[in-house]
Interface confidence: low
């Protein structure tokens, strides 16, 4: 195969819920023609599956391929360079992809005013690719977690946390006016897997939402 | 390579002026978030500031608000800390965070992915 190529320097997957990309940094004065070679492995099942023979991006969508993730026991992944007819030796990720290393996510954060209370639903993820009977909920059945963070505007970035355990949260603003913004970092309480914070909602409180009781 | 280099840190008595830099690798400096923590001896690592790359918005926490100021310089893949009116308790080593794929405002040190080695901060009174 003539001069051998180097090996892709790291392999490693980013994976929120039903959304699984392989990454991989790209090897050192690669030519135009340079391209990569994927293959996937799958736990229980000990042989290599070519995924892709040439990929010219640093990352490749493997969650069509690894739908039973939430019911196996995990996947690993390997890439090497590929330039004519030279190869690279195969870069293996160097932990299991299982159900762990799934970052938490929510859909959204859905907020609205109710006598001076923000009250607040958080919608799960729902994926295109998940099978149908593959949600959240059903997947990550018990101790669902949310934290919750509350900035008031103006306010100068002055923070309020919250832990809740349910989809549902209200928020006592005491009898302030002004925006507030919202954002939720998901967990559950028997797993270790990281959560991402949620893009920030906000919604105004005005005088006209409070109700003036003697 | 991904990496954050800081430097700046010494010793300084109270109420002097100090500026932290810390230098990111490219691929680092395109992240959303940068920040500066600190940690002192058996304390957690707290959050001071966090900037905003892409706008520039900042955040600090309450014990340094009016004291302490976070920057970027683009051009140079730069964060700055400036840091005024010092006290003793901000005596700590400080280290500058990036991460690369959240949208947190929250000073959290486990939502910062990549972290510098830290340059330490006397403060004598």
């Known amino acids: 195969h003539g001069t051998e190529l180097p090996s892709p320097p790291s392999v490693w997957f980013e994976a929120e819920f039903f959304h699984h990309i392989l990454h991989w940094t790209p090897i050192p004065n690669q030519s135009e023609s340079t391209c990569y070679e994927v293959a996937l492995l799958r736990y229980g099942i000990e042989s290599w599956n070519s995924i892709s023979n040439c990929s010219q991006t640093l990352s490749y969508d493997l969650t069509a391929v690894t739908l039973d993730l939430y019911h196996s026991n995990g996947y690993r992944a390997r890439v090497r360079a590929v330039d004519g007819s030279r190869h690279s030796n195969w870069t293996v990720t160097n932990t299991r992809f299982s159900v762990d290393e799934v970052t938490l996510t929510v859909g959204s954060v859905n907020l609205e005013i109710h006598n001076g209370f923000i009250l607040g639903k958080i919608q799960l993820p729902r994926p295109k690719m998940a099978p149908a009977n593959d949600t959240y909920e059903s997947i990550f059945s018990h101790f669902r977690e949310y934290e919750i963070a509350i900035r008031k505007v103006p306010g100068n970035f002055t923070f309020t946390h919250k832990k809740v355990k349910h989809e549902n949260f209200s928020l006592l603003t005491s009898g302030e006016v002004g925006e507030f913004c919202v954002q939720v970092k998901p967990s559950v309480a028997s797993r270790s897997n990281k959560g991402m914070w949620s893009k920030e909602e906000c919604i105004s409180l005005t005088r006209q939402y409070f109700t003036v009781t003697n | 390579q991904v990496q954050l280099q800081e430097s700046g840190g010494g010793s300084i008595q109270a109420g002097g002026s100090l500026r932290l830099s810390c230098v990111a690798s490219r691929y680092l400096y395109s992240t959303n978030y940068m920040a500066w923590f600190r940690q002192s001896p058996g304390k957690e690592r707290e959050a001071v500031a966090v900037i905003y790359t892409a706008s520039g918005a900042t955040l600090y926490t309450d014990s340094v608000k009016g004291r302490f100021t976070i920057s970027q310089d683009n051009a140079k893949m730069t964060v700055y800390l400036q840091m005024n009116r010092l006290k003793s308790e901000d005596t700590a080593m400080y280290y500058c965070?990036?991460?690369?794929?959240?949208?947190?405002?929250?000073?959290?040190?486990?939502?910062?992915?990549?972290w510098g080695q830290g340059t330490q901060v006397t403060v004598s009174s």
């Open positions: 965070a990036a991460v690369r794929k959240t949208d947190s405002y929250l000073f959290d040190a486990q939502s910062f992915t990549y």
